[in-house]
Interface confidence: low
């Protein structure tokens, strides 16, 4: 009696299952009690000897490429051996590498978590993912795994993480890079500082007083609101960041507390109050303002 090993599919792709069948064309296995064993190179596979003429391999990998055969043994201990069959496992090269961010869009708040997700549309086997940052492509991390996606995490984003990133995927056919992704780190405004600027050391009635408000940190655009006591004087925008000024023509009613507020949509901060008082110096004919 002759024995044949049949692999289905005969040219498997990595990660896919394969069924090995030990066939006896001129003998029904029911005619006699047989035990079957499957081998790769010199090693027995699966459970070793079994009454089933089939062996299911859940997933084949590139390293499973090799020479396979089977043996059948009767109760009388006669052993039949099949010819060797070469099974070549086909690796699919990585293709269509992309880099995505979580949160989406690449905009992240300072201090928040950023995840750079590298994905391939296809590719089998062990895929090495590498993440790169910055002017010369500094390697941040590499991961090798049997999956189509991998993640690189920055647990707490800093201002210095605002850069361009890309990833590379590779599974033995040469590196395949993704496109570049820009990360914007959004920074809430710091507490602004209010400065009063007058044209002379002692401002007089009808002088123009400049209220200058500036938050030293914060992503633009920043909107500044100016207050006298709790009354809103007006607002000014700083589209590119930095400070903003509000001009006021002084009258005697302008004594009191001044403050400003900075808001860039990520939170608002109010400055400390600055007090202005009108004083009448001895021998002077006009009122003067001091802060």
């Amino acid at each position: 009696a002759e024995l044949f090993l049949i692999a289905s599919p005969s040219h498997p792709t990595e990660g896919s299952p394969v069924t090995l069948t030990c066939k006896m064309p001129f003998l029904q296995s029911s005619d006699a009690q047989f035990q079957f064993c499957f081998f790769r190179d010199t090693r027995a596979l699966g459970p070793g000897w079994s009454s089933s003429p089939k062996l299911q391999i859940a997933a084949m990998w590139k390293e499973d490429t090799g020479s396979y055969w089977c043996e059948a043994q009767t109760m009388a201990s006669k052993v039949l051996r099949s010819r060797r069959s070469q099974i070549n496992v086909h690796r699919v090269p990585v293709a269509d590498v992309s880099l995505e961010t979580q949160p989406p869009g690449g905009q992240v708040m300072e201090g928040d978590r950023l995840v750079l997700i590298c994905s391939v549309a296809m590719g089998t086997g062990d895929i090495t993912f590498l993440w790169y940052k910055g002017a010369v492509g500094l390697n941040l991390q590499s991961k090798t795994q049997r999956s189509l996606t991998a993640e690189y995490e920055i647990p707490s984003v800093r201002e210095s993480d605002a850069e361009q990133y890309y990833c590379v995927a590779e599974n033995g056919y040469g590196p395949s890079p993704s496109g570049l992704v820009s990360i914007t780190v959004r920074i809430p405004v710091s507490r602004p500082i209010l400065m009063l600027r007058a044209p002379r050391a002692q401002a007089a009635v009808e002088d123009v007083l400049e209220l200058h408000c500036e938050a030293l940190r914060g992503s633009p655009p920043i909107l500044y609101w100016f207050y006298h006591e709790d009354i809103t004087l007006g607002s000014r925008s700083a589209p590119s960041g930095g400070g903003a000024s509000f001009n006021l023509s002084l009258t005697e009613e302008h004594s009191g507390n001044y403050s400003c507020e900075a808001n860039n949509g990520l939170g608002a901060q109010r400055s400390e109050a600055v007090t202005l008082n009108f004083t009448v110096p001895t021998g002077a004919r006009s009122n003067h303002l001091t802060s």
């Epitope: 492509g137 500094l138 390697n139 590499s142 590196p175 890079p177 570049l180």
Partner: antibody, heavy 117, light 112 residues
Framework: QVQLVQSGAEVKKPGASVKVSCKAS????????MHWVKQAPGQGLEWIGR????????KYNEKFKSKATITVDKSTSTAYMELSSLRSEDTAVYYC??????????WGQGTLVTVSS | DIVMTQSPDSLAVSLGERATINCKSS????????????LAWYQQKPGQPPKLLIY???TRESGVPDRFSGSGSGTDFTLTISSLQAEDVAVYYC????????FGQGTKVEIK
Amino acid sequence: QVQLVQSGAEVKKPGASVKVSCKASGYTFTRYWMHWVKQAPGQGLEWIGRIDPNSGGSKYNEKFKSKATITVDKSTSTAYMELSSLRSEDTAVYYCTRVNSGAMDYWGQGTLVTVSS
Amino acid sequence: DIVMTQSPDSLAVSLGERATINCKSSQSLLYSSNQKNYLAWYQQKPGQPPKLLIYWASTRESGVPDRFSGSGSGTDFTLTISSLQAEDVAVYYCQQYSNYPTFGQGTKVEIK
């Protein structure tokens, strides 16, 4: 195969400008940064700056900030470097070079710029 | 800027003998998150552009003969040509890419 082909040698007078081109082929142009390197006669290698062809964003060696301007044309996969206010010390071979994971893996053949009155 | 210093400036070695070039950086090129050194070695022959030999301090670029090897970590690095061939006569440069690129001044290798 990857190729970087640069424009031919140039002779310029002091004070003039020159624009050197570098045409890339054999790879996806927007996926790799392009750098420019200067080599004066008999001297070593000096980094000028780089450009990200995807966004057009560039960075320069402080020394070349007011000397070199690097640009790209994505439609033709070409990088350019313009040198302004040329002086005799700008006489050199200028190379474009692709950067892959930090190292400069492919180089153009070089363009000799001679500044002479 | 990171300053790269090569030694010696020139080197004369007999055919088949070992050639060793040293490179020292003014600050560490070892990136702690991946334990890689951001250093490359290049070979330049007269009238030709530089050619990448080694990157990550010790990884040989494809197609580069295995007589070329790179070693070292942190601030001290070495390029070794185990058995010098006539075609190895050239100037060799180290380059850091931990920051904006800077090169060593070059080492000229000749046959003794």
